[in-house]
């Protein structure tokens, strides 16, 4: 026959003001019978918590039901703590008896009336910017005591300086939260990088509670379109091609006109991304010159994360392409580009046929 | 000290009904499960039921699950058990008995209530 | 469901000597790393007594020459030495389900 080990996993608890506490305590046996007592304190003074046996203990409530058979979870919880609940709760077991004797007790646990702060939350704009403007992160943490609290941001390591915090409320209180709201001025190079809002607190030890929030979350860097023709084929088709390069976040639909017509749509997927985080894709259209008698007029529309449609236009002058093998070719780009260009060098394309 | 306090003894003509109590004290009477328990004169021990006072879960054997009903009252620590239909071969003393160790035993016992089913 | 049979039905042993009291389950009553048998003592005009629980753990303020014994569907009840006060029947009670009782054992004095 096993003997029977009162445990209380948790040497100590913390728990603010107001909120319940939970006091676990198992035993590792249903032999002897007998109820489960807790007390704070030890010796002769010691304070009865609560009895399975008898009693009233209106703030108490067993986290397991007594009844059930097999039940060996002698865990309390007590509501609303105050300060004066702080002390060693002790899980004893008494053998069934007149009266019942006690058996053992657990080792205690430590119940402190003083809160950690919550994990602390960073959230980002509802909707996405582009470079240069300036979004806002806010961060949140909650149920801590006492109110001295020192909170920072940082962007990829960097701290920043341009935030504001409040720590409410700003009276007394059995606990307090915490609100930081930090500008941060986005970069076309910001896809990876990311904002951390850094929590300390007296409870924490030195080591401080950190929530994070990526900038891919909150950047839109719109795409580079840029519309060219291959060589003319042996077969009097011309390869058009449309590239849309340094795109995030990576939803985006390019739809091909024929002088204003639908030709195809595609939409990006499963692409590979640029060492910044962007996106770059390539598509082409075979133009059957031989088909035409006029210029064909060829759009490339690209509507990038619901915004609206950029377009590039490109004129494929049929005059220009004689019905014979190996002619020349001669084209016209009317496109224009929506935004400036820094050209780079890390280019991944796509190709769909 | 645990104490389980039954009425008093019952004369029934068949075709009634009884109500026997058993008033509890000395511990928390939601905690602890009341089992019902009946000997006919000469015989040995019949299980009849049991009921958990806290939320008024019950377990009838099969036998008595159509004629038993168990009830507790917990605002006066006192748990029923009524038997309908009273035949003669229901004469018994009938016994509550508290499950301390909620083993699905009986620790403690009332002293027992005599119920006498005659025409 | 499962049925508890007692052996013998009644007994007469000397005080001092020995008394053995068996009870054997239609199927077994063994569940959760416990054996859900007991033990109960009726003396005439008394309800019954727990005396062991869970096979082989004595109640409190039982005195230790009660002993249980067994596992799965046999179990035995021992008195090592008989006493007048022993006189009574005996009955095992399982909980494995829900409970049933033995027929009882009537123990008297050789």
């Known amino acids: 026959e096993e003997e029977l080990q009162v445990i209380q996993p948790e040497k100590s608890v913390s728990v603010a003001a107001g909120e319940s506490a939970t006091l676990n305590c198992t035993a590792t046996s249903l032999i002897p019978v007998g109820p489960i007592q807790w007390f704070r304190g030890v010796g002769p003074g010691r304070e009865l918590i609560y009895s399975q046996k008898e009693g009233h203990f209106p703030r108490v409530t067993p986290v397991s039901d007594p009844t059930k058979r097999n039940n060996m979870d002698f865990s309390i919880r007590i509501s609303n703590i105050t300060p004066a609940d702080a002390g060693t709760y002790y899980c004893v077991k008494f053998r069934k008896g007149s009266p019942d004797v006690e058996l053992k007790s657990g080792a205690g646990t430590e119940l402190s009336v003083r809160a950690k702060p919550s994990a602390p939350v960073v959230s980002g704009p509802a909707v996405r910017a582009t470079a240069e403007h300036t979004v806002s992160f806010t961060c949140e943490s909650h149920g801590f005591s006492p109110r001295d609290i020192t909170l920072k941001w940082f962007k990829n390591g960097n701290e920043l300086s341009d935030f504001q915090t409040n720590v409410d409320p700003a009276g007394k209180s059995v606990s307090y939260s915490i609100r930081s709201t930090a500008r941060v001025v986005l970069t076309r190079r910001d896809v990876h990088s990311q904002v951390i809002c850094e929590v300390a607190h007296v409870t924490l030890q030195g080591d401080p509670l950190r929530g994070t929030a990526n900038l891919s979350e909150a950047i839109r860097v719109p795409p580079f379109l840029e519309v060219t023709q291959q060589s003319m084929r042996a077969d009097n088709q011309v390869n058009v091609t449309c590239q849309v390069t340094k795109f995030y976040p990576q939803r985006l639909q390019l739809t091909w006109l024929e002088n204003g017509n639908v030709s195809r749509t595609e939409m990006a997927s499963a692409l590979p991304e640029n060492k910044d985080g962007t996106y770059n894709w390539t598509s082409w259209l075979l133009v059957n010159v031989s088909a035409h008698r006029d210029d064909v007029k060829l759009t490339c529309q690209v509507e990038h994360d619901g915004q609206p449609a950029v377009n590039k236009s490109f004129s494929v002058k049929v005059s220009a392409h004689p019905k014979e093998q190996g002619s020349n070719t001669a084209a016209e780009n009317t496109g224009t580009n929506e935004r400036d260009y820094k050209d780079d060098d890390d280019k991944h394309h796509h190709h769909h046929h | 000290q645990v104490q389980l306090v039954q009425s008093g003894a019952e004369v029934k003509k068949p075709g009634a009904s009884v109500k026997v109590s058993c008033k509890a004290s000395?511990?928390?009477?939601?905690?602890?499960?009341i089992n019902w328990v009946r000997q006919a004169p000469g015989q040995g021990l019949e299980w009849i039921a049991m009921i958990d006072p806290s939320d008024s879960e019950t377990h009838y054997n099969q036998i008595f699950k159509d004629r038993a009903t168990l009830t507790t009252d917990t605002s006066t620590s006192t748990a029923y058990m009524e038997l309908r239909s009273l035949r003669s071969d229901d004469t018994a003393v009938y016994y509550c008995?508290?499950?301390?160790?909620?083993?699905?035993?009986?620790?403690?016992w009332g002293r027992g209530t005599l119920v006498t089913v005659s025409s | 469901d499962i049925v508890l049979t007692q052996s013998p039905d009644s007994l007469a042993v000397s005080l001092g000597e020995r008394a053995t009291i068996n009870c054997r389950a239609s199927k077994s009553v063994g569940s959760s790393g416990y054996n859900w048998l007991f033990w109960y003592q009726q003396k005439p005009g008394q309800p019954p007594k727990l005396l062991i629980y869970?096979?082989?753990n004595r109640d409190s303020g039982v005195p230790d020459r009660f002993s249980g014994s067994g596992s799965g569907t046999d179990f035995t009840l021992t008195i090592s030495s008989l006493q007048a006060e022993d006189v009574a029947v005996y009955y095992c009670q399982h909980s494995r389900e829900l409970p049933t009782f033995g027929q009882g054992t009537k123990l008297e004095i050789k």
């Open positions: 008995a508290m499950d301390y160790g909620s083993l699905y035993a009986m620790d403690y």
């Open positions: 000395g511990y928390t009477f939601t905690n602890y499960w």
């Open positions: 869970l096979a082989s």
